[in-house]
């Protein structure tokens, strides 16, 4: 009774299609696979960025897999063939592992790469990234930004740079069609006649770096002798009402400061008839139903009521 064996996949490799971190892992079937023609052979693939504690594990019948990686670090991956128990009279058979690595040969010392990279997706409409030049680089150093997300045929270069002293220190992006809820990849590389410049890679999802506009049309309405309803409108733009959280700051008679976080465009405040002055401001942020993270908007303009009975009128800014 001969022991059943299976070979590892052939030519296991990590292919960089030029998408700034979105890589293809691909392989060929093992030799002698047709011994198991009646069986569906599977592959167990493990991969990670070098330095990561944990492997991602995939089991697939395909000969390729695609995922995003941090190209600032190397990548390691391994794969083996799995013969299910149905093919082998009772126990799963695994091949030995085939292993491969990938990294971009770094140019220049780490200090030459851009510093303090910051990207904000203003009002879910306009992406702007800014950075500071690397430490100790000369004024002849220029940085170039490239970006890619699924849906683009190839990586694109920024066409509208923000400049300071002749150096590119930021990028205003064009309209980015169908670019949210997917990984957005950026590479900022550089050139200098003096020394090589280290490239930097960044990955994020646009909906997680949205900074909305502040709310507008703040109003007061007296609901009862001891309740005032504060109301406002969602900021203009493409973000739907269901996507907002709000933070309110209320000041009563220059003394009491109330802060609250709410999900709707209203807030009911308990007051006394003695209240002489009431002011509030509101800011907005994309909530957990629409993103994993976000940036608070600027505060709205302040809306105040002063020295008049709130029951007599609604104050509209």
């Amino acid at each position: 009774d001969t022991e059943i064996k299976v070979n590892p996949p052939q030519d296991f490799e990590i292919v960089d299609p030029g998408y700034l971190g979105y890589l293809y892992l691909q392989w060929q079937p093992p030799l002698s696979l047709d011994h198991f023609k009646e069986c569906t052979v599977e592959y167990e693939l493990k991969y990670r960025n070098i330095g990561s504690e944990t492997w991602k594990t995939i089991i697939t019948k395909n000969l390729h897999y695609k995922d995003g990686f941090d190209l600032n670090k190397g990548i390691e991956a391994k794969i083996h063939t799995l013969l299910p128990w149905q093919c082998t009279n009772g126990s799963e058979v695994q091949s030995s592992w085939a292993e491969t690595t990938y990294w971009i040969s770094p140019q220049g010392i780490p200090e030459t790469k851009v510093q303090d990279m910051d990207c904000v997706y203003y009002n879910w409409q306009y992406l702007l990234c800014s950075w500071k030049p690397g430490i100790g680089v000369l004024l002849d150093t220029n940085y170039n930004l490239f970006y890619w997300y699924e849906g683009l045929d190839h990586a694109l270069q920024c066409v509208d740079y923000i400049k300071a002293d002749g150096q590119n220190i930021g990028c205003r992006f064009p309209y980015l069609e169908a670019s949210d809820y997917k990984d957005f990849y950026i590479c900022v590389n550089g050139s200098s006649e003096n020394k090589p410049i280290r490239s930097s890679y960044f990955t994020f999802q646009l909906q997680n770096i949205v900074k909305p506009l502040p709310p507008v049309y703040l109003t007061f309405t007296r609901e009862s002798s001891c309740e005032i309803k504060l109301k406002w409108s969602i900021p203009l733009g493409p973000i739907p009402a269901r996507c907002f959280d709000y933070e309110i700051e209320i000041r009563e008679d220059d003394t009491t400061l109330v802060t609250a976080t709410v999900e709707n465009e209203t807030y009911t405040l308990k007051t006394t008839n003695e209240t002489r002055q009431l002011c509030f401001v509101v800011r907005s942020k994309v909530n957990i139903y629409c993103s994993d993270d976000g940036i608070w908007s600027e505060w709205s303009d302040k809306q105040c009521w002063e020295g008049e009975d709130l029951s007599k009128k609604t104050l509209l800014r």
Epitope: E13, Y24, L31, S32
Partner: antibody, heavy 118, light 107 residues
Framework: QVQLVQSGAEVVKPGASVKLSCKAS????????MSWVRQAPGQGLEWVAT????????YYPESVKGRFTITRDNSTSTLYMEMRSLRSDDTAVYYC???????????WGQGTLVTVSS | DIVMTQSPLSLPVTLGQPASISCKAS??????VAWYQQRPGQSPRALIY???YRYSGVPDRFSGSGSGTDFTLKISRVEAEDVGVFYC?????????FGQGTKLEIK
């Protein structure tokens, strides 16, 4: 349908270099390994080089190692072979071929005649 | 290197009759053998992979068999279009190697 279209015939002097190309269409080029096989006049087939789909792996027989280089450009679906320090016994028809998923060669180009002669 | 030895080197056959070509490997190549046909003035064409599996479009009069070191290509009824040279090839290990070819001609 799968097509492999090779560049035209070459006549070169001994010691010279030449670069052959093979333009692929009708399949996802980057998913397949590719090979070059040659056939000297009146002789049989001789394997010359293989490259993996992503280009990470290259294989050569001893007879051409160090002189021939197989490369590919997946963005243009083109396979290349650069041949240096050519000798008269390199005279042959050179075929590009797609390596199928079992590692055999399932589709072949029309061939390029390379003549090395002084 | 693995040497693939074909026999016979020349095979005259009467139309409609069967033909058989043998290919012996100098060491075990499991089932990792392919067969090719090269008609006069044409590029090679793949017939068989993994010793016994026909490529799509290959007539079922062609069949392959064998494993380890001994392999056979059979043509059940030879037709005029089968004229040419048949090659076996092993892909079990690099360097890939071909047999020297068997020339099939019509008697």
């Amino acid at each position: 349908q799968v097509q492999l279209v090779q560049s035209g015939a070459e006549v070169v002097k001994p010691g010279a270099s030449v670069k052959l190309s093979c333009k692929a269409s009708g399949f996802t080029f980057s998913s397949y390994g590719m090979s070059w096989v040659r056939q000297a006049p009146g002789q049989g087939l001789e394997w010359v080089a293989t490259i993996s789909g992503g280009g990470s792996y290259t294989y050569y027989p001893e007879s051409v190692k160090g002189r021939f280089t197989i490369t590919r450009d997946n963005s243009t679906s083109t396979l290349y072979m650069e041949m240096r320090s050519l000798r008269s016994d390199d005279t042959a028809v050179y075929y590009c071929a797609r390596r199928d998923l079992r590692s055999a060669m399932d589709y072949w180009g029309q061939g390029t005649l390379v003549t090395v002669s002084s | 290197d693995i040497v693939m030895t074909q026999s016979p080197l020349s095979l005259p056959v009467t139309l409609g009759q069967p033909a058989s070509i043998s290919c012996k490997a100098s060491q075990n190549v499991d089932i990792n053998v392919a067969w090719y046909q090269q008609r006069p003035g044409q590029s090679p064409r793949a017939l068989i992979y993994s010793a016994s599996y026909r490529y799509s479009g290959v007539p079922d009069r062609f069949s392959g068999s064998g494993s380890g070191t001994d392999f056979t290509l059979k043509i059940s009824r030879v037709e005029a279009e089968d004229v040419g040279v048949f090659y076996c090839q092993q892909y079990n290990a690099y360097p890939l190697t071909f047999g020297q070819g068997t020339k099939l001609e019509i008697k």
